[in-house]
């Protein structure tokens, strides 16, 4: 039975240029996790594997890092990035556990109504 | 000035699908995420999704997966909404509306589609 | 999903009352970068939602100064200073944060 629960950071609004930190966190559950995965849309950006550790699609490479802990920085933002980002857990004896976060990236200029946009 | 302009109502048959069309204008029409919003007897609201029409990244409530698919046409600046394998349950009025930039709400709403799922 | 629990369900008022209304999610809606995405709608019969604040506090354009918000966390008010007869309708609180974005159940403000 899966028990476990995962929480995000949250939808995040970004300027474009700027960085953010994705990170999703397993809680509730004693199961091992084995493997995670971050994913936009059907596209893979990383892996951090137990025993291997991390692995960046080649096409993320020069704009994605990886943690802090199990988390991905996205650097160099663009509107194209815009979009939603999953975090699945591997995990055994449960299985797979998925978390959402939708990160909309905004054209510098636009800071409408006094948005306070992240730029770490 | 923003303005959403839905299509009409619907009447249609159980194991039907369908699509609602939601024209935009009065905005850079790439720029905004468009939502949908469903409101089922007349009271309770739920998010059914968005699309970002820039890139056509979409984000789905698990809860309408496989009824509902959001679509955009950005040469005529308009979102449609397909509903699948329509019940009684899709009997609702649906909702366009434009997401705010910066802050994850909905500031300029289409005048709703009412949806009718009968025999 | 994130659950939005807004109180009271119905507010009888008379005009020029002052009137609160609650809306309580099951987790905080402050992301990790402190940013909270809250917002209020009003649902007039015949009419679209439309919005009248959003982060927590923010007036939309066109939104009268009696309507105002506050909280954070978990914990958010709508305050409406002067009831008006077009302030009558169902009103809603909205959560941002956390995928999928969830509606309260709504507060029907209705004359005594």
């Known amino acids: 039975m899966m028990t476990g629960t995962i929480e995000t950071t949250g939808n995040i609004s970004a300027e474009k240029g700027g960085s953010i930190i994705l990170q999703c966190h397993l809680s509730s559950t004693t199961a091992q996790v084995t493997q995670v995965n971050w994913e936009q849309q059907d596209q893979l950006l990383a892996i951090c594997n137990a025993d291997l550790g991390w692995h960046i699609s080649p096409s993320f490479k020069d704009r994605v890092a990886p943690g802090p802990g199990l988390g991905l920085t996205l650097q160099s933002l663009t509107v194209n990035d815009t979009g939603e980002y999953f975090c699945i857990y591997h995990t055994y004896p449960d299985g797979t556990y998925t978390g959402r976060i939708f990160l909309e990236v905004l054209e510098s200029s636009v800071a409408e109504h006094g948005a306070r946009f992240q730029i770490p | 000035e923003v303005q959403l302009q839905q299509s009409g109502p619907e009447l249609v048959k159980p194991g039907a699908s369908m699509k609602i069309s939601c024209k935009a204008s009065g905005y850079s029409f790439t720029g905004y995420t468009m939502n949908w919003v469903k409101q089922s007897h007349g009271k309770n609201l739920e998010w059914l999704g968005l699309i970002f029409p820039y890139n056509s990244a979409t984000s789905y409530n698990q809860k309408f997966t496989g009824k509902a698919t959001i679509t955009v046409d950005k040469s005529s600046n308009t979102t449609y909404m397909e509903l699948l394998s329509l019940t009684s349950e899709d009997s609702a009025v649906y909702y366009c509306?434009?997401?705010?930039?910066?802050?994850?709400?909905?500031?300029?709403w289409g005048q709703g589609t009412s949806v009718t799922v009968s025999s | 999903d994130v659950v939005m629990t807004q109180t009271p369900l119905s507010l009888p008022v008379s005009f020029g009352d002052q009137v609160s209304i609650s809306c309580r999610s099951s987790?905080?809606?402050?992301?990790?970068?402190?940013?909270?995405?809250l917002s209020w709608y009003l649902h007039k019969p015949g009419q679209s939602p439309h919005l009248l604040i959003y982060?927590?506090?923010n007036r939309f354009s066109g939104v009268p100064d009696r309507f105002s918000g506050s909280g954070s966390g978990t914990d958010f008010t709508l305050k409406i200073s002067t009831i008006k007869p077009e302030d009558l309708g169902m009103y809603y609180c909205l959560q941002g944060t956390h995928q999928p974005w969830t509606f309260g159940g709504g507060t029907k403000l209705e004359i005594k």
């Open positions: 987790q905080s809606l402050a992301n990790s970068y402190g940013n909270t995405y």
């Open positions: 509306a434009r997401g705010l930039r910066g802050f994850f709400a909905l500031d300029y």
């Open positions: 982060g927590i506090s």
